[in-house]
């Protein structure tokens, strides 16, 4: 018997319908937000529906359009910049990715005070990186690994860098493994606050191993893709960090910034660069073995034309019980006074707080403290800190803005957020004008999300930027499946747990479960946001609750549940899985025979490992793009967490928790494998060497592979990959198509 | 006080090799990027070569590029040009300059290289 | 390359008069790379100008420069007896740098 969510029969349920695939597939239920586009202390820029770009001045209600949609279509621009002497825009078109954070594109200066495109000395094509200074309207750009400055935009560039080469030097812009894994970002250069000087990284990968993969394409013969990419243990990249003037760049040329005498004596990284004035810059390193990071303080020596970084002013944050920060190194806020500074960094309980630097580390002052985590610091003004945690209600899964009076002693903290739209709102991000004399509140939910704006002294809201009426109209004759999150309390540990459970769900019926696994260090699964998905249709047209649950390693919740990991990866990510699982079925409803797991990426590797435990909980799974062993993913990421693969480091917990190494174990479960070929972060590597290993183990197996496609399986691809997913997972839980 | 002292030059044949210092005092010498500039007898002003303050990076004309090598000592203060292969063409008197590509603020008094069989 | 015509090749002109040197660039140069030099007979070069206009330190006031794009002035408002060179124009916007042929300019 095939037990089903029942049927209501009252007129007003007769006319709701349950999620399709098709709805999920099309984006029917995808909601917008707004993040205005400051340009001061009182105005944005926002592309309105018809793209036209408009500025909006709050205090005197006016906007007007800077810049027509016939202009933006006379190029096919689909990004804009504004010049901050507003004289000048750039467009951006011919868009085309990179990796995750990168792309190239094609750029257009348009010229608003003569309402023409600059004509004469145009930039080359395609542009890497492009941006305006902070002051007036110089530009900086990135064409084939070299960096080059532009005094006006009719003006002929000025290249800084020559040594600039694919795949061997990249300067302005990382390479793979620092846009991944440590920046985040497509660039890698920065401009001081008044656009004096500018500050660029140089990324050496030379002697970097190259990943090589096929890109099958249309061709005749197939592309090969290579990328210098390090894994584990393998050679990394070297970097240098200089500065230019870019008044006169020709006459000194870039002048280097040194690097910490005890960060330089082993292999380093860069992990991020912070002005703090035109002449004072911050720069943070870390060690390779990432439990050591030094904030670096350094200032324009004008009689020298050098940049000075004394050892005063280096202050090192160290983690004796895991990895320094939380998945990157946090970075400063500095205040007024251009020298002390506010971080968040774990207090002694280890919760991560904000504290502020005056003189020392040692001697900081803790701003928050609490067993809750400060998660964002927005904004520092004279009188106001403004950041986001996760204290209200101690739900480590929501996320409210806070405000703490630092003009006044002893300060005074007000949550901004908290009551604002309780149930709807429990989950915020906040984007501020200069001074913060203006900012916008985007909540993600629980409820449809919700875009407003208010004012910086007083908090109050001026109007709604966005709120998804459209959406809003569109699901009230959808039944969406009922959400709630829980926790479990587990030999001392806490497992917060979503579970999303039919429309019509009956705690007397039982349900097929799917386990919704990532579970990587210092993620958050479960959290309070607004998602019409995948997992929502599989509740509510095809009866099955689903569970997310945050296990060790995940963040938010201090430093013991986050480190718990440290050196041991899929291993407590997995027993947590299985420990909630295990509490799922006492709760009576679930169906036992009927239990699956499914992840990507870091999910995957769980996933697997949860399906060869040997428990016999789960009946089938699937992996997407999933990691099968620590040795072939990056070496920033892997060795954060788990240092290096050597015989005198921890190269025996590498071999031991490998998917291959329990191949016999997934005989008794129904495996679904599935991986882009095209994969330039988790390499198609890992899922050959997990399939190698069933073959020899004569174990059967279910995949399929995504030629061409990389780690994100986009376009076509993800419709096939959901429909191809929901049909194993029908079929598993013997549910009729 | 800036000052730039310039040596090494003298007669060469052709094919063969010569080494150029020059002195630079009154200033961080390896903060800033150097040149040399030279002058052929009777003739205008030619860039030859320049590197970074750290001596990482280097530059050459193409007329001298595959002969010529510029290195500096920053803990002698001291910036080199390596001549080899020299052509009649490369008589000149030969300028140390203090900057990158432009402006060169100060100059040595420069040395003077003659190639001649 | 970037070449720099500088023209006229010599100017004769008597101490007091005023003087105009012109620089025009084969493609356009942004002006704070551009540079005026003065050198005398056995004298190495010395800087006048960078930046277009910008006078190098200890420089009188009487040296000026303009221009901007491929047109470039260096301008003498009343020569002195000291001022008789040979005046190079240099652009560093593009690699390799590159001087002018120099104008001379000598007594009448």
């Known amino acids: 018997i095939v037990l089903r969510p029942s049927r209501v029969h009252n007129s007003e349920e007769n006319t709701m319908r349950a999620l399709t695939l098709k709805d999920i597939l099309n984006g029917t239920f995808s909601y917008k937000t707004f993040f205005p586009n400051w340009i001061s202390g009182q105005e944005y820029l926002h592309q309105s529906a018809d793209n036209n770009i408009v500025l909006y001045n709050i205090e005197t209600g006016q906007s007007y359009t800077i810049l027509s949609n016939r202009t933006m279509k006379s190029v096919n621009a689909s990004n804009y910049g504004l010049s901050p002497d507003r004289q000048f825009v750039y467009l951006e078109s011919d868009y085309s990715k990179l990796w995750r954070y990168s792309y190239t594109a094609t750029y257009y200066i348009y010229d608003l005070s003569n309402g023409e495109f600059v004509r004469g000395n145009e930039l080359p094509r395609p542009i890497q990186y492009l941006c305006w200074s902070p002051v007036g309207s110089k530009l900086a750009y990135v064409y084939q690994n070299n960096i080059y400055l532009k005094q006006r935009p009719g003006d002929p560039p000025f290249q800084i860098t020559f040594n600039g080469r694919e795949n061997k030097i990249f300067n302005g812009i990382p390479d793979w493994v620092y846009e991944e894994e440590m920046l985040a970002t497509k660039y890698a250069l920065w401009w001081s606050p008044n656009g004096k000087f500018l500050a660029y990284a140089e990324f050496n990968d030379t002697d970097i191993p190259v990943i090589a993969y096929s890109y099958y394409g249309d061709e005749q013969y197939p592309r090969t893709i290579n990328i210098p990419y390090p894994k584990a243990g393998a050679k990394n990249p070297v970097v240098r960090i200089f500065i230019i003037d870019t008044t006169y760049p020709a006459y000194v040329g870039p002048q280097e910034v040194p690097v910490p005498a005890m960060i330089a004596s082993s292999d380093y990284y860069f992990s991020w660069l912070t002005w703090v004035t035109d002449e004072r810059v911050c720069l943070q390193w870390l060690k390779r073995v990432q439990n050591v990071s030094v904030l670096s303080i350094c200032d324009f020596r004008e009689d020298w034309q050098t940049w000075d970084c004394p050892k005063t002013q280096e202050h090192i944050e160290e983690s004796r019980t895991g990895w320094a920060g939380g998945f990157f190194v946090s970075t400063p806020v500095f205040s007024y006074d251009a020298i002390s500074y506010y971080k968040i960094f774990s207090d002694k309980d280890g919760y991560k707080h904000i504290h502020y630097i005056k003189d020392t580390v040692e001697n900081a002052i803790q701003i928050t403290s609490g067993k809750w985590e400060a998660i964002n610091i927005f904004r520092v003004t004279q009188d106001s800190l403004f950041y986001s945690s996760n204290e209200f209600e101690e739900y480590p899964g929501r996320r409210n803005i806070y405000r703490i009076s630092i003009g006044s002693y002893p300060p005074s903290k007000k949550c901004v957020t908290c009551h604002l739209r309780k149930e709807r709102c429990q989950y915020y991000t906040a984007s501020f004008s200069d001074y913060a004399k203006y900012y916008a509140l985007v909540c993600y939910g629980p409820g449809i999300p919700i875009s407003t704006l208010h004012d910086g002294r007083t908090d109050q809201e001026i109007k709604i930027l966005e709120e998804n009426k459209e959406l809003e109209n569109a699901l009230k004759n959808i039944q969406l499946p009922k959400e709630e999150i829980k926790k479990l309390e587990v030999d001392e540990i806490t497992l917060w747990y979503k579970m999303i459970l039919p429309p019509q769900f009956d705690r007397s019926k039982k349900y097929p479960l799917l386990i919704q696994v990532y579970g990587g260090p210092c993620s958050q699964s479960v959290r309070s946001v607004f998602a019409v998905n995948w997992i929502s249709y599989l509740a509510s047209k095809e009866g099955m609750v689903i569970a997310l649950v945050d296990g060790r390693g995940t963040a938010f919740q201090g430093d013991k549940l986050l480190y718990a990991v440290y050196r041991k990866l899929g291993v407590y990510e997995v027993e947590d899985q299985i420990t909630a699982v295990r509490k799922f079925i006492e709760m009576g409803f679930i169906d036992e025979k009927r239990i699956a797991i499914w992840g990507w990426s870091y999910g995957g590797y769980v996933s697997s490992l949860a399906l060869a435990s040997g428990t016999g909980l789960f009946k089938c799974g699937i992996a997407v793009a999933p990691v099968s062993s620590w040795e072939y993913y990056a070496s920033v990421y892997t060795e954060r967490f788990m240092g290096l693969p050597t015989k005198d480091d921890n190269l025996e917990h590498y071999k031991n928790s490998t998917v291959m190494a329990r191949a016999e174990y997934f005989r008794n479960v129904d495996y679904l494998l599935i991986h882009g070929t095209a994969d330039d972060n988790v390499h198609f590597q890992n899922s050959a060497q997990i399939a190698k290993a069933l073959v020899n183990a004569q174990v059967d197996f279910q995949a399929m592979w995504y030629s061409d496609q990389n780690h994100g399986l986009s376009g076509l691809s993800t419709n096939h990959l959901y429909t191809h997913m929901t049909h194993f997972l029908k079929q598993c839980f013997s549910l009729s198509d | 006080e800036v000052q730039l002292l310039e040596s090494g030059g003298g007669l060469v044949q052709p094919g063969g090799s010569l080494r150029l210092s020059c002195a630079a005092s009154?200033?961080?010498?390896?903060?800033?990027?150097m040149s040399w500039v030279r002058q052929a007898p009777g003739k205008g002003l030619e860039w030859v070569s320049a590197?970074?303050?750290?001596?990482?990076?280097?530059y050459y004309a193409d007329s001298v590029k595959g002969r010529f090598t510029i290195s500096r000592d920053n803990s002698k203060n001291t910036l080199y040009l390596q001549m080899n292969s020299l052509r009649a063409e490369d008589t000149a008197v030969y300028y140390c300059a203090k900057g990158w590509f432009t402006p060169f603020d100060y100059w040595g008094q420069g040395t003077l290289v003659t190639v001649s069989s | 390359e970037i070449v720099l015509t500088q023209s006229p090749g010599t100017l004769s002109l008597s101490p007091g008069e005023r003087a105009t040197l012109s620089c025009r660039a084969s493609q356009s140069v942004s002006s704070n790379y551009l540079a005026w030099y003065q050198q005398k007979p056995g004298q190495a070069p010395r800087l006048l100008i960078y930046?277009?206009?910008i006078r190098a330190t200890g420089i009188p006031d009487r040296f000026s420069g303009s221009g901007s794009g491929t047109d470039f002035t260096l301008t003498i408002s009343r020569l002195e007896p000291e001022d008789f060179a040979v005046y190079y124009c240099q652009q560093g916007n593009q690699i390799p740098p590159t001087f002018g042929q120099g104008t001379k300019v000598e007594i009448k």
């Open positions: 930046g277009a206009s």
């Open positions: 590197i970074s303050g750290s001596g990482g990076s280097t």
């Open positions: 009154g200033f961080t010498f390896s903060s800033y990027a």
